[in-house]
């Protein structure tokens, strides 16, 4: 089989601070040295890019400075964290992995992680 399998959790609940973390694991058919990981959000059949990072195997995963994502990599596993989430951001977050180099190129699409975000209740004013 030439397809690359990507595994990710089915459901994740964001913290009260709007932070959600999940692991994206891929079964590499070859020895990739350059990998691109993209987080996509799917809502009502529309797909948008949340963040993306290209890394060399053995090096750290680096997202752009203004990205809402951070991450670390270890072998064929990527630990992804998405920050600044609000209730309206609840949705399906798909992990996409591309083995860019060396040839052949492989594409792997995960089934998606449903991230639930609940906005925290505002603190009541203190009478003290």
């Amino acid at each position: 089989c030439k397809a690359m399998h990507v595994a990710q959790p089915a459901v994740v609940l964001a913290s009260s601070r709007g932070i959600a973390s999940f692991v994206c694991e891929y079964a590499s058919p070859g020895k990739a040295t350059e990998v691109r990981v993209t987080v996509l959000r799917q809502a009502d059949s529309q797909v948008t890019e949340v963040c993306a990072a290209t890394y060399m195997m053995g090096n750290e995963l680096t997202f752009l400075d203004d990205s809402i994502c951070t991450g670390t990599s270890s072998g064929n596993q990527v630990n992804l964290t998405i920050q600044g989430l609000r209730a309206m951001d609840t949705g399906l977050y798909i992990c996409k992995v591309e083995l860019m180099y060396p040839p052949p190129y492989y594409l792997g699409i995960g089934n998606g992680t449903q991230i639930y975000v609940i906005d925290p209740e505002p603190c009541p004013d203190s009478d003290f």
Epitope: C1, A3, M4, E34, T48, K96, P104, Y106, I109
Partner: antibody
Framework: EVQLVESGGGLVKPGGSLRLSCAAS????????MHWVRQAPGKGLEWVSF????????YYADSVKGRFTISRDNAKNSLYLQMNSLRAEDTAVYYC???????????WGQGTMVTVSS | EIVLTQSPGTLSVSPGERATLSCRAS???????LAWYQQKPGQAPRLLIY???SRATGIPDRFSGSGSGTDFTLTISRLEPEDFAVYYC?????????FGQGTKVEIK
């Protein structure tokens, strides 16, 4: 409007060269991989070449390897195909296509005709 | 290289009838990586189905895809006059990206 527009096709003699261009508009060009696909008269679709987001990685069909070079300029939202040592069998309509976020070629240009004949 | 073989080469169908097109891969293709395209004379191909069964934006629900492994199917439930065209399957899970040779759906 989200679109791709190819240009640069024409008639060229065997052994000659041609440079195709593809102008992208209406989307963040650097967030997508890009491809060239060709179609010989009356024939099916044949993938020609691929280029990664930043242009660092490039792949080619065996039939054009060593003769064609793909490149992109993200600042200009443009994709290119430099075709050298052209042969009669390279005669085709050449399409640029966007590699969609989930992988399929979700946006195509209108195509540009390349004819290689003496 | 994954070779895709489409059948039949030509399908003659009357408007309103059902059309079933087949695409067979030389080795297993993950269902997430199989697409179908429609091409009319003088036009560029248009994405119909991706991920074996998901309809692209704006594609009517009379088009449906199914299958897994090495066998995939495109079904057009009720052929409209504008559906007479050539249809291609494609795998995009690994390089080289490959297309089937196409199935022409013509008016009977």
């Amino acid at each position: 409007e989200v679109q791709l527009v190819e240009s640069g096709g024409g008639l060229v003699k065997p052994g000659g060269s041609l440079r195709l261009s593809c102008a992208a508009s209406g989307f963040t060009f650097s967030s997508y991989t890009m491809h060239w696909v060709r179609q010989a008269p009356g024939k099916g679709l044949e993938w020609v070449s691929f280029i990664s987001y930043d242009g660092n990685q490039k792949y080619y069909a065996d039939s054009v390897k060593g003769r064609f070079t793909i490149s992109r300029d993200n600042a200009k939202n443009s994709l290119y195909l430099q075709m050298n040592s052209l042969r009669a069998e390279d005669t085709a309509v050449y399409y640029c296509a966007r590699g969609g976020l989930l992988g399929p070629f979700d946006l195509w240009g209108q195509g540009t005709m390349v004819t290689v004949s003496s | 290289e994954i070779v895709l073989t489409q059948s039949p080469g030509t399908l003659s169908v009357s408007p309103g009838e059902r059309a079933t097109l087949s695409c067979r891969a030389s080795q297993s293709v993950g269902s997430s990586y199989l697409a179908w395209y429609q091409q009319k004379p003088g036009q560029a191909p248009r994405l119909l189905i991706y991920g074996a069964f998901s309809r692209a934006t704006g594609i009517p629900d009379r088009f449906s895809g199914s299958g897994s492994g090495t066998d995939f199917t495109l079904t057009i439930s009720r052929l409209e006059p504008e559906d007479f065209a050539v249809y291609y399957c494609q795998q995009y899970g690994s390089s080289p990206w490959t297309f089937g040779q196409g199935t022409k759906v013509e008016i009977k």
